[in-house]
Amino acid sequence: AVNGTSQFTCFYNSRANISCVWSQDGALQDTSCQVHAWPDRRRWNQTCELLPVSQASWACNLILGAPDSQKLTTVDIVTLRVLCREGVRWRVMAIQDFKPFENLRLMAPISLQVVHVETHRCNISWEISQASHYFERHLEFEARTLSPGHTWEEAPLLTLKQKQEWICLETLTPDTQYEFQVRVKPLQGEFTTWSPWSQPLAFRTKPAALGKDT
């Protein structure tokens, strides 16, 4: 179904991974497709097999090296191709000259932990994962807190406009269970987008002491 609407989107995690999604309406679920990466100034080529993630979309990760190795720079251009098997031959279905540092999506922050918790406040820290040293401090974060009886979508976003890997949540309710998530985005890149949200960190505020407010 070549005439069905199709789209090919990839992001670079800033180190050694390009994640791609290929979608095509009307394509057969058992179609065998792959992504091929051909850099303009590197000696390596890389291929990954597209695996179904929904009725009409497939995804794969181009693993370029060890997770923390810096495999691409701001001057690299990687020609990407979607190839699908048709009988005995491979057919090119999509092509793109990909500038990695214009299309960034970092890994979700990791190692979330409660540094200190009180009745109305909680200090939380986290770490970024597999982020290029090129960014130096040019990163921003968004955080959200899940309160009882609400959904993540209803949670207000807290914006940290600098590389600050901690937050002090205030005006919390005593003896209450909360969850917390954070995501990161480099300031660089015309098509750069937010990382996935971190795994939620559950915490509970301390109960109010009888007869006094902490």
């Epitope: 070549v2 005439n3 069905g4 609407t5 199709s6 789209q7 090919f8 989107t9 095509q24 051909w38 303009d40 251009i77 020609t79 990407l80 191709r81 979607v82 279905m93 999509a94 092509i95 793109q96 000259d97 214009e102 299309n103 015309e190 098509f191």
Partner: nanobody, 125 residues
Amino acid sequence: EVQLVESGGGLVQAGGSLRLSCAASGRTFSTTEMGWFRQAPGKEREFVAAITWTGRGTMYAESVEGRFTISRENAKNMVYLQMNSLKPEDTAIYYCAAARRGRAAVRSEGGYDFWGQGTQATVSS
């Protein structure tokens, strides 16, 4: 915003050649993937060929592979379609298209934001 103007169409005998040109205006041309589509009388518009912005990547419809060649000259804001060994079934209006900025060139019309008015190519038998 990219404006596209095609030229080079005409009447040619089967087995002959034509070279279509697409002149683009707009600052983003040099980093935009480009494609050619065609529409024969009474038929839907179909993909013909596409090229990445550096020219490193190309793809073709099965029906034209080996006969047509897409190329580009970014310094002149031009895209070309060299059509050899033409057949009567290649008769169509040929359209130049610019892919969505920062996005891949695909085989479906929906992946392209900007279109030219088209140029007629007629192949007689």
